[in-house]
Interface confidence: medium
């Protein structure tokens, strides 16, 4: 049998008596910023090079007794999880360790910064293949640590970090809150979020995905053949660093954006029991458990998209929230969500030469979220077409008029506090797939894209009786790019994409009463790229 | 004792290298901001990361660090430059009294200053 954690991340076709998926990450170097390590442990001997970098604070307490095996414990275990020859994920990956945590597992932001700088300088002096940096540590939110991670990521380095073990919003911690970093929460053998004493894994919109992080067998620094079971988001992050090394070894040219999208795409979906998370965090927390891709090649043809939630706008009347895609991603649609239902919609707008998704709070609202649908679409040319409020009974319309441009998303934004009870369809009338339609007092925004072989279609699911939630999913081979609602008179809280499903939320039926409430229709825009599919077939 | 000697030596050097030009007013533009960890027990007051504007060169970082030392010395404060950053972010790590933050925030090229804080194995 193989340990539960390795089984969980391994697609069924790899499973055998021994966990030995093809190519163990041998083209990739993984940097570990942690405690000192026991480099002669059988699991990692010859695989981990201990650099001369050390920047740690003194241990607390005058009576602290330095014991080598305890000093090495955390780092040794993680090195084993990443590349251990028997209990590791990427058995072929080589590692370099930097000591930024002392014998009590404590370090400083400044020491970590200097460590990251050391990696960047090493990369410049001796460029090698793909680099993965594992940061199995967390501190309070730090602007400077996040900025350093951003710079390193933009230099082509993949950074993977622990979400934190504080049973709290990961956005309050660094480097977990850095958007460029792949932030990993922890789940157990039952796919439950990991509880650690009175605390547990962090959660929220800053977490990219979860991975095994409880009762993980790995190298123990007690002796060169000892093993120990450890738990935490560090262990979870180590799994993802190993998976990233495997993926990069198979496809060394992958960008950070491509790698992140693949990690999300190949994750197990909707297996985590969300009841563990605070209610207000459930919608924001990704229900994804990391896994290796079923085959190392052939994923290139797919149109990959992910959902990015903004921070909460706050309750002030003119408050807005902004969701952004990564530099290599295209914003294909923008939606908004408010728990109170009081919002003034959303719009796509240019900011620093890039489209962002901005949601607007309304008077008396508790705040809004902007939700961006961020996709990998090579050679894309996207623009936003806006129609101002029409003030005509027929409503506001906007369509993609340029030749070869297809509609990937619709947004609607209104200045008035209340659009009234009669909201005509937010999307196009039937038979006009390249058109968005909205209330006459709202401005409507169509996201129109041209990319080789890109085709899109609209899919609706309407429920006549009022429902708290209406969903519509794109079928196999199609990717959800846009998600919005065609409301009747029901009070829509907003719309957002969860994996390939468009979710439209309405106010709780029990509080609104269902007598006069109208139907709610969830509208998905589903796209695929024939060009990407063709290119992939030609390669094979 | 060693540390004190080191600090004294740096103070003397800072005073010696002070020039009229070092006292010039900071560049006009946006005011630099100060950040610190929201979790009080994790704060490490007395050590600060001074982050300079994106295009600042290493020589300017070193000059700004020396300027801070000189201006601090003029006010009777010891400072110690622990590290000069370049490669990822321009800036420097300085050990100094929090009393000097206002002064440091007015230095040319400064984007923001962050008080050092703890990180922990997870």
């Amino acid at each position: 049998s193989i340990p539960w954690n390795l089984e969980r991340i391994t697609p069924p076709r790899y499973r055998a008596d021994e966990y030995q998926p093809p190519d163990g990450g041998s083209l990739v170097e993984v940097y570990l910023l942690d405690t000192s390590i026991q480099s002669d442990h059988r699991e990692i001997e010859g695989r981990v090079m201990v650099t001369d970098f050390e920047n740690v604070p003194e241990e607390d307490g005058t009576r602290f007794h330095r014991q080598a095996s305890k000093c090495d414990s955390h780092g040794t275990h993680l090195a084993g999880v990443v590349s251990g020859r028997d209990a590791g994920v990427a058995k072929g990956a080589s590692m370099r360790s930097l000591r930024v945590l002392n014998c009590q597992g404590k370090g400083t932001v400044s020491g970590t910064l200097i460590g990251l700088e050391f990696i960047r300088k090493s990369q410049l002096v001796q460029p090698v293949g793909p680099l993965v940096v594992l940061l199995p540590l967390a501190g309070g939110y730090s602007r400077v640590l996040n900025a350093a991670c951003q710079r390193l990521a933009r230099a082509g380095v993949v950074l993977v970090t622990a979400a934190g073990n504080f049973r709290d919003d990961a956005c309050l911690y660094s480097p977990a809150s850095a958007p460029e970093v792949i932030t990993v929460g922890a789940t157990n053998a039952q796919d439950q979020p990991v509880t650690l004493g009175t605390l547990g894994t962090n959660f929220g919109r800053c977490v990219d995905l979860f991975a095994p992080g409880e009762d993980i067998i790995g190298a123990s620094s007690d002796c060169s053949t000892c093993f120990v079971s450890q738990s935490g988001t560090s262990q979870a992050a180590a799994h993802v660093a190993g998976i990233a090394a495997m993926m990069l070894s198979a496809e060394p040219e992958l960008t950070l954006a491509e790698l992140r999208q693949r990690l999300i795409h190949f994750s197990a979906k909707d297996v985590i029991n969300e009841a563990w998370f605070p209610e207000d965090q459930r919608v924001l927390t990704p229900n994804l458990v990391a896994a290796l891709p079923p085959s190392t090649h052939g994923a290139g043809w797919q149109l990959f998209c992910r959902t990015v939630w903004s921070a909460h706008s706050g309750p002030t009347r003119m408050a807005t929230a902004v969701a952004r895609c990564a530099p290599d991603e295209e914003l294909l649609s923008c939606s908004s969500f408010s728990r109170s239902g009081k919002r003034r919609g959303e719009r796509m707008e240019a900011q620093g030469g890039k489209l962002v998704c901005r949601a607007h709070n309304a008077f008396g609202g508790e705040g809004v979220y902007a939700i961006a649908r961020c996709c990998l679409l090579p050679q894309a040319n996207c623009s936003v077409h806006t129609a101002p409020p029409a003030e005509a009974s027929m409503g506001t319309r906007v369509h993609c008029h340029q030749q070869g441009h297809v509609l990937t998303g619709c947004s609607s934004h209104w200045e008035v506090e209340d659009l009234g009870t009669h909201k005509p369809p937010v999307l196009r009338p039937r038979g006009q797939p390249n058109q968005c339609v909205g209330h006459r007092e709202a401005s409507i925004h169509a996201s129109c894209c041209h990319a080789p072989g890109l085709e899109c279609k609209v899919k609706e699911h309407g429920i006549p009786a009022p429902q708290e939630q209406v969903t519509v999913a794109c079928e196999e081979g199609w990717t959800l790019t846009g998600c919005s609602a065609l409301p009747g008179t029901s009070h829509v809280l907003g719309a957002y994409a969860v994996d390939n499903t468009c979710v439209v939320r309405s106010r709780d039926v029990s509080t609104t009463g269902s007598t006069s409430e109208g139907a709610v229709t969830a509208v998905a825009i589903c796209c695929r790229s024939r060009h990407l599919a063709q290119a992939s077939q030609e390669l094979q | 004792q060693e540390d004190e000697d080191g600090d004294y030596e740096e103070l003397v050097l800072a005073l010696r290298s002070e020039e009229d030009g070092l006292a010039e007013a900071p560049e006009h533009g946006t005011t630099a901001t100060f950040h610190r960890c929201a979790k009080d027990p994790w704060r490490l007051p007395g050590t600060y990361v001074v982050v300079l504007k994106e295009e600042t060169h290493l020589s300017q970082s070193e000059r700004t660090a020396r300027r801070l030392q000189a201006q601090a010395a003029r006010r009777g404060y010891l400072t110690k430059i622990l590290h000069v950053f370049h490669g990822l972010l321009p800036g420097f790590l300085v050990k100094m009294s929090g009393d000097l933050l206002e002064l440091a925030l007015k230095l040319p090229h400064v984007d923001y200053i962050e008080e050092d804080s703890s990180v922990f194995a997870q």
Partner: antibody
Framework: EVQLLESGGGLVQPGGSLRLSCKAS????????MHWVRQAPGKGLEWIGR????????KYNEKFKGKATISRDNSKNTLYLQMNSLRAEDTAVYYC??????????????WGQGTLVTVSS | DIQMTQSPSSLSASVGDRVTITCRAS??????LTWYQQKPGKAPKLLIY???SLQSGVPSRFSGSGSGTDFTLTISSLQPEDFATYYC???????????FGGGTKVEIK
């Protein structure tokens, strides 16, 4: 099927030396540490040392340092034990054993059939 | 250095008997203790690893327990093929070496 086949045993003069071989098959040789263990007639098992075929790193029982040398040839999937300055008390059956990994522990899971070395004039 | 002491050094038992063999380490070896069975003229065979985990293919009448310094191998109902010598083996942290117990010979009564 994992198999370990020792050879090279026999009669050796006191003060002489010998080289034992252990040919491995049925698994990836470089992925598992290999041990040499001996057993004198009517006595218990005694560990001599081990090698990591992946890196070539070795560890020895203090008693055998300077007397035994363990090496390997990964291209031939073969483990070797060189013994020098042999004395009558080195008469024993010599076993090679694979060190297998079992969910957080190791054990000598496959053993060769053993080869008898007799040191006598 | 760690010493491994097995007791008894030999015992006589009948088919169907419950047999218990103990192994004591002079220092804590955690759960890193392995049991082997050896029949005359044959190589040792792995029975139990990590103190209590049964190697696949080994009958369930064999069980192991213990942690730290005291360990036990139990054969719940002795079978004719179980007459053999049993060795415990531990890992010596300080020497990065491997130490065997003196062996316990289980003979037919």
């Amino acid at each position: 099927e994992v198999q370990l086949l020792e050879s090279g045993g026999g009669l050796v003069q006191p003060g002489g030396s010998l080289r034992l071989s252990c040919k491995a098959s049925g698994y990836t040789f470089s992925s598992y540490w290999m041990h040499w263990v001996r057993q004198a007639p009517g006595k218990g098992l005694e560990w001599i040392g081990r090698i990591d075929p992946y890196s070539g790193g070795t560890k020895y029982n203090e008693k055998f340092k300077g007397k035994a040398t363990i090496s390997r040839d990964n291209s031939k999937n073969t483990l070797y034990l060189q013994m020098n300055s042999l004395r009558a008390e080195d008469t024993a059956v010599y076993y090679c054993a694979r060190y297998g990994y079992y969910l957080g522990s190791y054990a000598m899971d496959y053993w060769g059939q053993g080869t008898l070395v007799t040191v006598s004039s | 250095d760690i010493q491994m002491t097995q007791s008894p050094s030999s015992l006589s038992a009948s088919v169907g008997d419950r047999v218990t063999i103990t192994c004591r380490a002079s220092q804590d070896v955690s759960r890193y203790l392995t049991w082997y069975q050896q029949k005359p003229g044959k190589a040792p065979k792995l029975l139990i690893y990590a103190a209590s985990s049964l190697q696949s293919g080994v009958p369930s009448r064999f069980s192991g327990s213990g942690s730290g310094t005291d360990f036990t191998l139990t054969i719940s109902s002795l079978q004719p093929e179980d007459f053999a010598t049993y060795y415990c083996q531990a890992y010596d942290y300080s020497l990065s070496g491997y130490v065997f117990g003196g062996g316990t010979k289980v003979e037919i009564k």
